[in-house]
């Protein structure tokens, strides 16, 4: 018979034959042959593989480093990685939660809608027309543009979401 060019799901092609992949939680020890099945071994303590695979090494569980404010939210198994979270009152810097911050800041062009609490991070909002923020801050709201008119001045440079307007003297028409 012709050697296969493609294999079924949960199989892989090697040496012109289809071998079974190792199930999650196990790593490949040896490929199958004409006479033997794929040989797999369970991952060791603190290791995992989360897919049907032909990996010869299991992945190490993530370490939740207490020096970075991390603690274990969910202990890893042979099939799943450890999930880290931050100490109470601190917030993950990313979905992967590799480090912790007290709270995030709102970038220039954004103002703070809600200051962080122990359970929720800073909520930012874009500065609308007529308002600006030129700083990165965890507490400052968007500031309204300066009103040149109330100072008997005119707008020399328009404001943006990151900059205030620039006021200047009115042009005096000479008689």
């Amino acid at each position: 018979p012709e050697p296969p060019t493609a294999c079924r799901e949960k199989q892989y092609l090697i040496n012109s034959q289809c071998c079974s992949l190792c199930q999650p939680g196990q790593k490949l020890v040896s490929d199958c042959t004409e006479f033997t099945e794929t040989e797999c071994l369970p991952c060791g303590e603190s290791e995992f593989l989360d897919t049907w695979n032909r990996e010869t090494h299991c992945h190490q569980h993530k370490y939740c480093d207490p020096n970075l404010g991390l603690r274990v939210q969910q202990k890893g198994t042979s099939e799943t990685d450890t999930i880290c979270t931050c100490e109470e009152g601190w917030h993950c810097t990313s979905e992967a939660c590799e480090s912790c911050v007290l709270h995030r800041s709102c970038s220039p062009g954004f103002g703070v809608k809600q200051i962080a609490t122990g359970v929720s991070d800073t909520i930012c909002e874009p500065c609308p027309v007529g308002f600006f923020s030129n700083v990165s801050s965890a507490f400052e709201k968007c500031h309204p543009w300066t009103s040149c008119e109330t100072k008997d001045l005119v707008v020399q440079q328009a404001g943006t979401n990151k900059t205030d307007v620039v006021c200047g003297p009115q042009d005096r028409l000479r008689a």
Epitope: W90, C100, V101, S105, S136
Partner: nanobody
Amino acid sequence: EVQLLESGGGLVEPGGSLRLSCAASGFTFAGYEMWWVRQAPGKGLERVSAISGSGGSTYYADSVKGRFTISRDDSKNTLYLQMNSLRAEDTAVYYCAKEPYSFDHRGQGTLVTVSS
């Protein structure tokens, strides 16, 4: 290396005052927004007060408004928290924090105990 060293805590009677300091080193202090946070025994972190990098804007938690004053001296690379009319519920370890407020940049804190 960023270092924040808090000091000025101690035991004080209700109604008394304390002034906390936070000496900063390892970064250009001027221009950085700074915060005071506190952690009471067995409780979570509470954000107490903040001051903008320019010193022109401040924030106070409702629980300390009118009693605490935050300030900074950029020439001394130091942040301050003047605490007046202290109450038992102000008892906590007080920490200062700088943007981006990473856990590994926090100081060791200074303990404030308000008790008669």
